[in-house]
């Protein structure tokens, strides 16, 4: 706390501006109006205060809005936002994607900080969904904004926000994430034509079930290895040898590469060997020639 | 500019772990593989395993089984390999090398870290 | 395991002459797994041809790959001074993976 003490005369700030820069921490605090600091928030940040000054003008602003700031100060705190604390931003109520931008500019470049989780929890909370436009700010600012929210979370994202994703926003992103995430994508993306649809959809596929990529392997989609290592490995068990030839198309050669790598790995032990031969990429590990499979997990569906 | 940049020399005692780290910039982390091969002095190349970053599934060259873990943390796109129980012999340079995923050829390689294990 | 071995383990030669290095398997490999490396004294190796042929990029066209089955061969047509290095050839088609014990290539 900075002790009250009476401004010195002459002393009187009438505008924000640099001169502030020369008054001790007392000084500021006896001699700038909070309302006046209030209405001139935006000048704030051109001027080259030292962090116990900010402090200072934090308390001013603290004394002013004890039940938390307008948004109207919010939009302008500028470096002034570093030093809340999440507390003091669960007081704001944040509704326009502006001052959204404005803070998270402030923090452009660093790790998401606890304020800026906080703040961006505020501001979706009251939204009540990611919004397009809200998940391509997010997203700019923070790429692995998505994949930091639980499935629960991401249920409230609308199909047509997911236009707003780039492949590098999921890089992060779970396989029970992408469970949530692709149907929404599929919704999103289903009026494109085939080779459009799979460039959208191909970042979201580790959540696809093995029908899609049945469908998938119809369509000449040339999936790369990359795609297909981030598939469910349940999805891609049950698909043939014909089947993942036609959906690597010309990659099918990688897997050669990836043969210990799960999920191609599980995928070869199902394979009958003399199919995996039809390759001619020497996988190893397949079903050997005489071999009746059994699968019981059918069988204790029948029984 | 691709670059795998990796963690500064170590000289550890025989029993002890080493960890080092491969950082990777300039291109997708998650399209490619990341393999460790190691040089002891004057002698040729060791392939030890490799790590798939998107999926975090590893495999290791049996010589190094039960000694050696590889782990990835995406959001660094930095790759770690950790090796235990180290004995004299493992005293070497020990390389981080990128694989595209779906290929078996090493692109682009760290500059290597100089492990020495020394009583 | 595949054990690969080069062959010489030394080669002096001049600037200007062609060098060619083997690379032997203890069995067979498929030609799209084998890969060449150059290493210089206190440096990272370096990519020079994979798939037994194909040039990696940046690599001059007076290095060449060939070969099949058990037996691989890398050619410099006309030694540069700054082909005076290591190389290790590296198989993926059978696991472990492994690679060669080295051919010097020093002046002569």
């Known amino acids: 706390e900075v002790e009250k003490t009476a401004c010195p005369s002459g002393k009187k700030a009438r505008e924000i501006d640099e001169s502030l820069i020369f008054y001790k921490k007392w000084e500021l605090e006896a001699c700038v109006d909070a309302a006046l600091l209030a209405t001139q928030m935006d000048r704030v940040n051109a001027i080259p205060f030292t962090y116990e000054q900010l402090d200072v003008l934090k308390h001013k602003l603290d004394e002013l809005y004890p039940q938390g700031y307008p948004e109207s100060v919010i939009q302008h705190l500028g470096y002034l936002f570093l030093k809340m604390s999440p507390e003091d931003i669960r007081k704001w109520n944040v509704t326009s994607l502006e001052t959204l931008k404005a803070l998270l500019e402030v923090n452009k470049g660093h790790e998401m900080s606890p304020q800026v989780a906080t703040l961006i929890d505020r501001f979706v909370k009251g939204r009540g969904q990611l919004d397009k436009d809200t998940l391509d700010t997010l997203t700019a600012f923070y790429p692995g904004y998505l994949c930091s929210l639980s499935p629960e979370e991401l249920s409230s994202v609308p199909p047509s926000s997911i236009w707003a994703v780039r492949p590098q926003d999921l890089d992060t992103c779970d396989p029970r994430q992408l469970d949530v995430l692709y149907p929404k994508a599929r919704l999103a993306f289903q009026n494109m034509n085939g080779s459009e649809y799979f460039v959208k959809i191909q970042s979201f596929l580790g959540g696809a079930p093995t029908e899609d990529l049945k469908a998938l392997s119809q369509q000449n989609v040339s999936m790369d290895l990359a795609t297909f290592m981030k598939l469910r490995t349940d999805a891609v068990l049950p698909l043939t040898v014909a089947e993942v030839q036609k959906l690597l198309g010309p990659h099918v050669e990688g897997l050669k590469a990836e043969e210990r790598h799960r999920p191609v790995r599980d995928w070869i032990l199902r394979q009958r060997q003399d199919d995996l031969d039809t390759l001619g990429l020497g996988l190893q590990g397949g079903i050997p020639n005489g071999y009746l499979v059994l699968d019981l997990s059918m069988q204790e569906a029948l029984s | 500019e691709v670059q795998l940049v990796q963690s500064g020399a170590e000289v550890k005692k025989p029993g002890a772990s080493v960890k080092v780290s491969c950082k990777a910039s300039?291109?997708?982390?998650?399209?490619?593989?990341m393999d460790w091969v190691r040089q002891a002095p004057g002698q040729g190349l060791e392939w030890m395993g490799d790590?798939?970053?998107?999926?975090?599934?590893?495999i290791y060259n049996q010589k190094f089984s039960g000694r050696v873990t590889m782990t990835e943390d995406k959001s660094a796109s930095t790759v770690y390999m950790e090796l235990s129980s180290l004995r004299s012999e493992d005293t070497a340079v020990y390389y981080c090398?990128?694989?595209?995923?779906?290929?078996?050829?090493?692109?682009?390689w760290g500059q290597g870290t100089t492990v020495t294990v020394s009583s | 395991e595949i054990v690969l071995t080069q062959s010489p383990a030394t080669l002096s030669l001049s600037p200007g002459e062609r060098a060619t290095l083997s690379c032997s398997a203890s069995?067979?490999?498929?030609?799209?797994?084998l890969s060449w490396y150059q290493q210089k004294p206190g440096s990272s190796p370096r990519l020079l041809i994979y798939?037994?042929?194909n040039l990696a990029s940046g690599i001059p066209a007076r290095f060449s790959g060939s070969g099949s089955g058990t037996d691989y061969t890398l050619t410099i047509s006309s030694l540069e001074p700054e082909d005076f290095a290591v190389y290790y050839c590296h198989q993926w088609s059978s696991f472990p993976y492994t690679f060669g014990g080295g051919t010097k290539v020093e002046i002569k």
């Open positions: 300039g291109y997708t982390f998650t399209d490619y593989n």
């Open positions: 798939r037994t042929s």
């Open positions: 790590i798939n970053p998107s999926t975090g599934g590893t």
């Open positions: 090398a990128r694989r595209r995923i779906g290929t078996g050829y090493f692109d682009v």
């Open positions: 069995s067979s490999v498929i030609s799209s797994y």
